[in-house]
Every structure is written in structure tokens, then in C-alpha cells.
């Protein structure tokens, strides 16, 4: 799957309303000077399969952020205004399913949402030049 | 599907320098998240290194700073270079490929690494 053919207007619109403010929750308590991420992504649909990737996808420090907040809204954004995307997710909400649940110390994956919001903030500028 | 081949593993003193390579044929590459494991003896398998397609990486505190993982998409090709190698580094490496939508992983065969001290 890319995310080519997304409506990304509506994706921002989307993550200016509600993903940005639950990121930010999850972040609260922290500088933006804790993190020192260089994250890039080069166009809109490659940005969308970086948050793709450290949403829903396990990393060395943060096992899993798939039932936060923003990350259930990412879901259901990357579902409403990506066609087909609903349909790659059904084997991953059945592994899931089969998975033993994990508890997971948020303080792990503070550097992992530190990225995402950096990867959001490339996506509304590359959203921008484009206009 | 995506198969991987992992190499480069060996004998080395601490201190020394080792670069794993994984090599993958077929198809999803390209965006899959890959990993790096590593399994020591007795101990459960533990993910310690993960790249995303456009290279953000992500390391266990244990080896960061001494550890890069890096990845050429043209070449189909992962490594891990590991610096100033230590005892407690020894251990089979393992490398994984995950569809970043549907969760399925491949896995290499593994390579062992074995740092004398």
C-alpha cells in the first residue's frame, strides 16, 4: 500500500484538530529540547508511511503506542481519508489479538512521539509548499 | 515475501569492531520497518536496533552510541556496525523484516557473535 491517492487536506485538517493536541498531551511535562530527532520524510505519502511505521509498529525502546489516543486517531484518519488503507489492517488487528499484552512505561516511547511529531510537522510543510 | 540472509558475524576481542550485513531478496523491502535482534544465551530474544524506510532509527540504551544500524533500499541491504564491542554484546543476531500494516515479519536464520574478553 502507498498513500498516494489520500486526501492529504483532510488528513491536516484532521491532525490540526485532534492528533497534534493528543500528541502534545502525551509529550506534556517534557522540553522539545529533551530529544534531539532529525526525522525527514520527502513527500506527503512517504511522511504518512513514516508515521505509519513508529505508530503502529514496535521499536527497541517502545513496544507498542497502537492504543494510544492519537494513535487510534491516526487509524481512523489514515481509514476515512486514504482509500483502501482499512483493508491493511485487518491482519494486524488479529495478530494484535494473538499478541500477550505488554505493559509499557511511557517514558520509553517519549522519544518515539517526539519523532512522530516531528514527521507530522514535515508533513503539514510539505503540505504548505505544495500549495 | 521477504527473505533474509544475515552475515558477517564472528570472533572478535572487546573493544574491537564487527558490521553485520542482512541481505534480502523478494518483494516489501522497501517500506518494511526492519530490526535487529539479538539473542544471548538463556535469555529471551531482544530487539535492540529498528530503522523505518526513510532511515529514522531507533537503538535499546544498552547499545546506543556504539551501535548504527543503517540501510541501503537500492541494495536491498540492512547492517548493524557495532563499536567498541563487549562481552555481554555476545550472542546470536538476528535480522527481521515487518510490514509496517499488517505486522507479518521474516526473519533471518541469525549470525552468532562472540566477543572474548
Known amino acids: 500500500y502507498d498513500f498516494t491517492n489520500c486526501d492529504f487536506q483532510k488528513i491536516e485538517a484532521d491532525y490540526l484538530r485532534t492528533i497534534s493536541k493528543d500528541l502534545i498531551t502525551y509529550m506534556s511535562g517534557t522540553k522539545s529540547t529533551d530529544f534531539n530527532n532529525t526525522v525527514s520524510c520527502s513527500n506527503r505519502p512517504h511522511c504518512l508511511t513514516e508515521i505509519q511505521s513508529l505508530t503502529f509498529n514496535p521499536t527497541p525502546r517502545c513496544a507498542s503506542l497502537a492504543k494510544e489516543m492519537f494513535a487510534r486517531k491516526t487509524k481512523a484518519t489514515l481509514a476515512l481519508w486514504c482509500p483502501g488503507y482499512s483493508e491493511t489492517q485487518i491482519n494486524a488487528t488479529q495478530a494484535m489479538k494473538k499478541r500477550r499484552k505488554r505493559k509499557v512505561t511511557t517514558n520509553k516511547c517519549l522519544e518515539q512521539v517526539s519523532q512522530l511529531l516531528g514527521l507530522w510537522r514535515r508533513f503539514i510543510r510539505t503540505l504548505l509548499k505544495k500549495q | 515475501e521477504v527473505q533474509l540472509v544475515e552475515s558477517g558475524g564472528g570472533l572478535v576481542q572487546a573493544g574491537e569492531s564487527l558490521r553485520l550485513s542482512c541481505a534480502a531478496s523478494?518483494?516489501?523491502?522497501?517500506?518494511?520497518?526492519l530490526y535487529w535482534y539479538r539473542q544471548a544465551a538463556g535469555i529471551e530474544r531482544e530487539l535492540i536496533a529498528s530503522i523505518t524506510s526513510g532511515g529514522i532509527t531507533n537503538y535499546v540504551d544498552s547499545v546506543k552510541g556504539r551501535f548504527t544500524i543503517s540501510r541501503d533500499n537500492a541494495e536491498n541491504t540492512m547492517y548493524l556496525q557495532m563499536n567498541s564491542l563487549k562481552a555481554e554484546d555476545t550472542g546470536v543476531y538476528y535480522c527481521a523484516s515487518r510490514n509496517i500494516f499488517d505486522g507479518t515479519t521474516e526473519w533471518g536464520q541469525g549470525t552468532l557473535v562472540t566477543v572474548s574478553s
Open positions: 523478494g518483494s516489501g523491502f522497501g517500506v518494511n520497518i
